[in-house]
């Protein structure tokens, strides 16, 4: 039971966190215009990777997609790459997690197939997060750099007489968006792989060793069960030493994987 | 097209308060627009006095922060003007507009004159 | 604030000549964001309120004819009525629109000589 809540609930983090990966890179806020001294302003620029917006006081926003890939900084291209890598891979994370998901039933599926199928997505899940977490993490230490660069030079005067406020940029919803669904799908990811080592079947088996008292056949089989999720997930113990030893599914009847869905 | 209309005492005296009051019609006040006050006095030139906007966030001219009030009724699609401890530098045409695009005032009513006196 | 400096003060042309009205701003109306000039202009007839003429210092307000045009960035800007016409005698004035407070230049008056 505890293997399937774990296994659940890690799909579920991964999911939002994906969710919120897709979110943070279609966002138009990774950067906004700095206030610093002027809560109020009568035009409010902001930044994504795809496009810049500029709102209006008045309430009139226009924004302008980025129609160049030449001219864009390398670090913004940067970025891009590691958001929809991060995207790729949560996708197929999650394509792949559906099918390990123990509660789905897929055919006569075996538990060392989902074990494996949840370990892939499992590794996809921190991979997807750390792209996010470093696409997001690289961007906000360009915002940092340019900040303190623009800040050195906020006023460019002519004589002193004409002032050229240039505009300064700060963090913007996207980047927090960007890593907590990052950490969202990190943890997801990192569930799942806990999850995996609870489904994998055992393949220590130990050897049945049968005591033959007078007149009667009876075995005594030490270890021969695997550590039992108590979700029915036991497999058949292979026959080892067929000394008047019996199977524990010859013992008793376990219920079958397929029983829950 | 959206439409102004200024409505008001005509006369005003020295310390009272001056209150306008601007309907609206053909748009919504709600609307992703900013509902300005500004000013004309008699043979000089413009003064913007402040606005709401469509999130209902206000700004003021600093010269006039202290004294200005600006709201509005969404119910009765109208937006007004306060402006206290008026004197006779107060007295002047005042228009309401409409700003948008470029934050330009694209449409003004046709302006009341206040006149402060005793 | 930004101080807004129209000149000439007053300006009078003969009809179907051109007209040209300068506006300084004390600092750049440019915006980095959108590499957009917020200096608008408006046209006062007597007894009416003034209409707008041209915003983001050279995009034509509908319905306002070609003959006027905006042109200018940062801190110094131009309107011009290429042809002018009868109708064209009133004040003009420049606005910033770029930056709290929005203040107005003291006005042009074209007249016809």
């Known amino acids: 039971m505890a293997v399937t809540a774990c296994q659940g609930l890690g799909f579920v983090v991964s999911l939002i966190g994906i969710a919120g990966i897709i979110a943070a890179t279609c966002m138009d806020q990774w950067s906004t215009q700095d206030l610093y001294n002027n809560p109020v302003t009568a035009v409010f620029n902001y930044q994504g990777l795809w496009r810049s917006c500029v709102r209006e006081s008045s309430g009139f926003t226009e924004c302008r997609g980025y129609f160049t890939l030449l001219g864009l900084p390398a670090m913004l291209q940067a970025v891009r790459a590691l958001m929809i890598v991060g995207i790729v891979l949560g996708a197929i994370g999650l394509l792949v997690s559906i099918f390990a998901l123990k509660c789905i039933r897929i055919g006569s599926m075996e538990d060392s197939a989902k074990a494996n199928m949840t370990l892939t997505s499992g590794i996809m899940f921190i991979v997807s997060g750390l792209c996010a977490i470093a696409g997001v993490s690289v961007f906000a230490n360009m915002l940092v750099t340019n900040f303190w660069m623009s800040t050195a030079n906020m006023y460019t005067g002519m004589g002193g007489m004409v002032q050229t406020v240039q505009t300064r940029y700060t963090f913007g919803a996207a980047l927090f968006v960007g890593w907590v669904a990052g950490g969202l799908t990190l943890i997801g990811g990192v569930m799942m792989c806990i999850a995996c080592r609870g489904l994998a079947p055992e393949e220590t088996n130990y050897k049945a060793v049968s005591y033959h008292a007078s007149g009667h056949s009876v075995a005594y089989k030490p270890g021969g069960f695997k550590a039992s999720t108590g979700f029915g997930s036991n497999t058949k113990n292979k026959k080892i030493y067929d000394g008047g030893a019996r199977t524990e599914d010859e013992v008793q009847s376990y219920p079958s994987k397929h029983d829950y869905v | 097209q959206v439409q102004l209309q200024e409505s008001g005492p005509g006369l005003v005296k020295p310390s009272e308060t001056l209150s306008l009051t601007c309907t609206v019609s053909g748009g919504s006040i709600s609307s992703n627009y900013a509902w300005n006050w500004i000013r004309q006095p008699p043979g000089k030139g413009l003064e913007w006095i402040g606005y709401?906007?469509?999130?209902?966030?206000?700004a003021y001219n600093p010269s006039l922060k202290s004294r200005v009030t600006i709201s509005r009724d969404t119910s009765k699609n109208q937006f007004s003007l306060k402006l206290s401890s008026v004197t006779a530098a107060d007295t002047a045409v005042y228009y309401c507009?409409?700003?948008?695009?470029?934050?330009?005032?694209?449409?003004w009513g046709q302006g009341t004159l206040v006149t402060v006196s005793s | 604030d930004i101080v807004m400096t129209q000149s000439p003060d007053s300006l009078a042309v003969s009809l179907g000549e051109r007209a040209t009205i300068n506006c300084k701003s004390s600092?750049?109306?440019?915006?980095?964001?959108?590499?957009?000039?917020?200096l608008t202009w408006y046209q006062q007839k007597p007894g009416q309120p003034p209409k707008l003429l041209i915003y983001?210092?050279?995009t034509r307000e509908s319905g306002v004819p070609d003959r006027f045009s905006g042109s200018g960035s940062g801190t110094d800007f131009t309107l011009t009525i290429s042809s002018l016409q009868a109708e064209d005698v009133a004040v003009y004035y420049c606005q910033n629109a770029y930056s709290f407070p929005w203040t107005f230049g003291q006005g042009t008056k074209v007249e016809i000589k």
């Open positions: 507009a409409t700003s948008y695009y470029g934050n330009s005032f694209i449409y």
């Open positions: 983001w210092a050279s």
């Open positions: 600092q750049s109306l440019l915006n980095s964001g959108n590499q957009k000039n917020y």
């Open positions: 709401i906007n469509y999130s209902g966030n206000t």
